[in-house]
Interface confidence: medium
Amino acid sequence: VPQKPKVSLNPPWNRIFKGENVTLTCNGNNFFEVSSTKWFHNGSLSEETNSSLNIVNAKFEDSGEYKCQHQQVNESEPVYLEVFSDWLLLQASAEVVMEGQPLFLRCHGWRNWDVYKVIYYKDGEALKYWYENHNISITNATVEDSGTYYCTGKVWQLDYESEPLNITVIKAPREKYWLQ
């Protein structure tokens, strides 16, 4: 049975600033015909037929659900892209993470401006801070890492706060063992 394709993002963030670029790639096993990809944005078929969909100089209208399909294979699971205009944007490698998988958080400044005194918060409590900007790496996510995250920081000497982001860590499905 052919596998469902999977949409991946490069850079890996599904929350980006207006004007930024992101490439969506339709990955799957044994898809030899690279020009036979269908892309759907908010349910509408896109003109793009390559296995990669480039979003250049993102606009608010680029927000929404993206799916891809190779030949007769099932559509991929949807990926949701959000385009923002703000001073700070908290980005996550994924908003729903399987337990044991890595999770990366990034406090991203508008126009890639430097952000100083970056503080990451989880459920209203300071999680970690640096005087310069750093990403947060959680190597093995646990259910306890679920929560509402946001970051604060200084841009051009003024203090700003990102919109909150909900992260959910779900338990990995248990393997079934049968008695022989």
């Epitope: 999680l127 970690k128 801070y129 640096w130």
Partner: antibody
Framework: EVQLVQSGAEVKKSGESLKISCKGF????????IGWVRQMPGKGLEWMGI????????RYSPSFQGQVTISADKSISTAYLQWSSLKASDTAMYYC????????????WGLGTMVTVSS | QSALTQPRSVSGSPGQSVTISCTGT?????????VSWYQQHPGKAPKLMIY???KRPSGVPDRFSGSKSGNTASLTISGLQAEDEADYYC??????????FGGGTKLTVL
Amino acid sequence: EVQLVQSGAEVKKSGESLKISCKGFGYRFTSYWIGWVRQMPGKGLEWMGIIYPGDSDTRYSPSFQGQVTISADKSISTAYLQWSSLKASDTAMYYCAKDNPFTGSFDIWGLGTMVTVSS
Amino acid sequence: QSALTQPRSVSGSPGQSVTISCTGTSNDVGGYTYVSWYQQHPGKAPKLMIYDVSKRPSGVPDRFSGSKSGNTASLTISGLQAEDEADYYCSSYAGSYTWVFGGGTKLTVL
């Protein structure tokens, strides 16, 4: 009241090991970096290194890298500074200090631990 | 990572003003606003007097002020008082979560 309480004075011989402590009170210990500062007799302050007790992220001054180990036990709100083999030149007062991201400085200091190493 | 440069000693009479300089590089003092000043009386722990170049923590008299120009920060104490006699250290963030202190300045109130 926010305070850092350091362990008592130590007298040691060259080659011995030592671990001194700094316990935080009155604030969320895991959420602030703790720095260590050396002051040799009659000399100035030297920044040694710093630890974030929440995840044990640690940074060292190049001058102290490999000479000391900074660690923390967040379950008892305590940071540590340790030596595996002391030298006479380690004789000094050692201070721990709490970093404050809102002031960009060390706002709370321990009273210091005097370490005396005889050869 | 060299120590910041401070004068070894300064002195002044009660009521006068004194200024202590602290010279670093563009990698520390010149590169960040995170410059602090600490006061240390003999046998005591250092005490924060100025942070973020020029801000005073609550409880610190407004006779203490800080400034910065390029790679040099300054601490000015006006209306000098006997209890101001102490050692003063500047400190700067130096990037990647490292700090550097100055060599210290002994202030004598004549």
